[in-house]
């Protein structure tokens, strides 16, 4: 299953990065799982994941650094609290969970660049 | 003449971006000209330029947004005062001016990403 995502995104100076993850569904899925993975060197770690029913909202866990909205075969993902050290390749993984058959789709990754802001001068 | 430069550089939150431009000199040049070009769409504009004698310092004009140092076949370039709208591809062009023959080298460009900082809160 094909998954498209932008090649590059810049995080805002507040450490927030948003991008769209779009998938070409081969079937009529009613339950979809979206996972954001971070690839550094050959290590792949899960950043966040959410399962949603088509037509319903995308809900991440309360302590997740991700939020998102879904519209058809598009998911708008936002990652918050990013620091310069979090700069890296963020991969969108989409799984069509129900009904069977299961389908896996993995994007090529979005390179997110993060620049730490300069601290504001102390107010005297 | 081959010119190497990094593919991507992030400007600091102060709008400063630095990168190295390295060239493989086919002769014993004594006078070298370095130009930074910005490519946006199909438009190429000159950002700054400096001519230097080998072994001497690299001197840009006083009102230039660029500064730099040279060491052998390497030039360390710094561009200041960058804003988010200045994000783009910055190409390093090197010309061996003297003695003849003249040689031209153009790098593949460095994608400089710039994020505007959040304004600091007013001090009451």
């Amino acid at each position: 299953m094909h998954v498209a995502q932008p090649a590059v995104v810049l995080a805002s100076s507040r450490g927030i990065a948003s991008f769209v993850c779009e998938y070409a569904s081969p079937g009529k899925a009613t339950e979809v799982r979206v996972t954001v993975l971070r690839q550094a060197d050959s290590q792949v770690t899960e950043v966040c994941a959410a399962t949603y029913m088509m037509g319903n909202e995308l809900t991440f866990l309360d302590d997740s650094i991700c939020t998102g909205t879904s519209s058809g075969n598009q998911v708008n993902l936002t990652i918050q609290g990013l620091r310069a050290m979090d700069t890296g390749l963020y991969i969108c993984k989409v799984e069509l969970m129900y009904p069977p058959p299961y389908y896996l789709g993995i994007g090529n990754g979005t390179q997110i660049y993060v620049i730490d802001p300069e601290p504001c001068p102390d107010s005297d | 003449m081959h010119v190497a430069q990094p593919a991507v550089v992030l400007a600091s939150s102060r709008g400063i971006a630095s990168f190295v431009c390295e060239y493989a000199s086919p002769g014993k040049a004594t006078e070298v000209r370095v130009t930074v070009l910005r490519q946006a769409d199909s438009q190429v504009t000159e950002v700054c330029a400096a001519t230097y004698m080998m072994g001497n310092e690299l001197t840009f004009l006083d009102d230039s947004i660029c500064t730099g140092t040279s060491s052998g076949n390497q030039v360390n370039l710094t561009i200041q005062g960058l804003r988010a709208m200045d994000t783009g591809l910055y190409i390093c062009k090197v010309e061996l001016m003297y003695p003849p023959p003249y040689y031209l080298g153009i790098g593949n460009g460095t994608q400089i990403y710039v994020i505007d900082p959040e304004p600091c809160p007013d001090s009451d």
Epitope: R33, E46, A49, P101, Y102, L104, G105 | -
Partner: antibody
């Protein structure tokens, strides 16, 4: 480090039942799908079943559909395979295997042998 | 349902030689979600290569994967004594998650 340990295999008569377990450690169990894969003596690998994440979504090979049930208890980091109406052709080493973040099976247990014989 | 065919069934080679194993799918494999596993007698399978050219952690660079669509290849550039084993391909892009019948690489 990641570890998967199967248990519950043994000799059972045709038509009887058996439950296999697979205890996982060294990773966040609920973040991974887990498969059962079997290998009959001297034969190749055959996919049996998979269970995903919170345990609601499952898939089975046609050869075991309606007879085998895969389940998991995320609080115990344990995967199960309930095998009913066993047949001689179910005789195999049963492996549990973890789904890697990018999809393949990156860690496998050592396997447990199930022999269906009268 | 995907049917995976592996060839040859057995490959007889000497240490130091190059091994080329083939895996062919009955239909195009989505996003090239194909993996290769190695299995030695009495042991569980071990992941070697996935999608279809990324090496798994700890796998030496003598192992490489290539291919797309329906035709995939596992290459062992220089066979070491420990490389003589069974090799399976598997598609993992959609259920059912089929395996190929395997190729045995044995010592000539």
């Amino acid at each position: 480090q990641v570890q998967l340990v199967e248990s519950g295999g043994g000799v059972v008569q045709p038509g009887r039942s058996l439950r296999l377990s697979c205890v996982a450690s060294g990773f966040i169990f609920s973040s991974h799908g887990i498969h059962w894969v079997r290998q009959a003596p001297g034969k190749g690998l055959e996919w049996v079943a998979v269970i995903w994440y919170d345990g609601r979504n499952k898939d089975y090979a046609d050869s075991v559909k309606g007879r085998f049930t895969i389940s998991r208890d995320n609080s115990k980091n344990t995967l199960y395979l309930q095998m009913n109406s066993l047949r001689a052709e179910d005789t195999a080493v049963y492996y549990c295997a973890r789904v890697a973040p990018l999809g393949p099976l990156d860690y496998w247990g050592q396997g447990t042998l199930v022999t269906v014989s009268s | 349902e995907f049917v995976l065919t592996q060839s040859p069934g057995t490959l007889s080679l000497s240490p130091g030689e190059r091994a080329t194993l083939s895996c062919r799918a009955s239909q195009s494999i989505s996003s090239n979600f194909l993996a290769w596993y190695q299995q030695k007698p009495g042991q569980a399978p071990r992941l070697l290569i996935y999608r279809p050219s990324s090496r798994a952690t700890g796998i030496p660079d003598s192992f490489s994967g290539s291919g797309s669509g329906t035709d995939f290849t596992l290459t062992i550039s220089r066979l070491e004594p420990e490389d003589f084993a069974l090799y399976y391909c598997q598609q993992y892009g959609t259920s059912p998650f089929t395996f190929g019948p395997g190729t045995k690489v044995d010592i000539k």
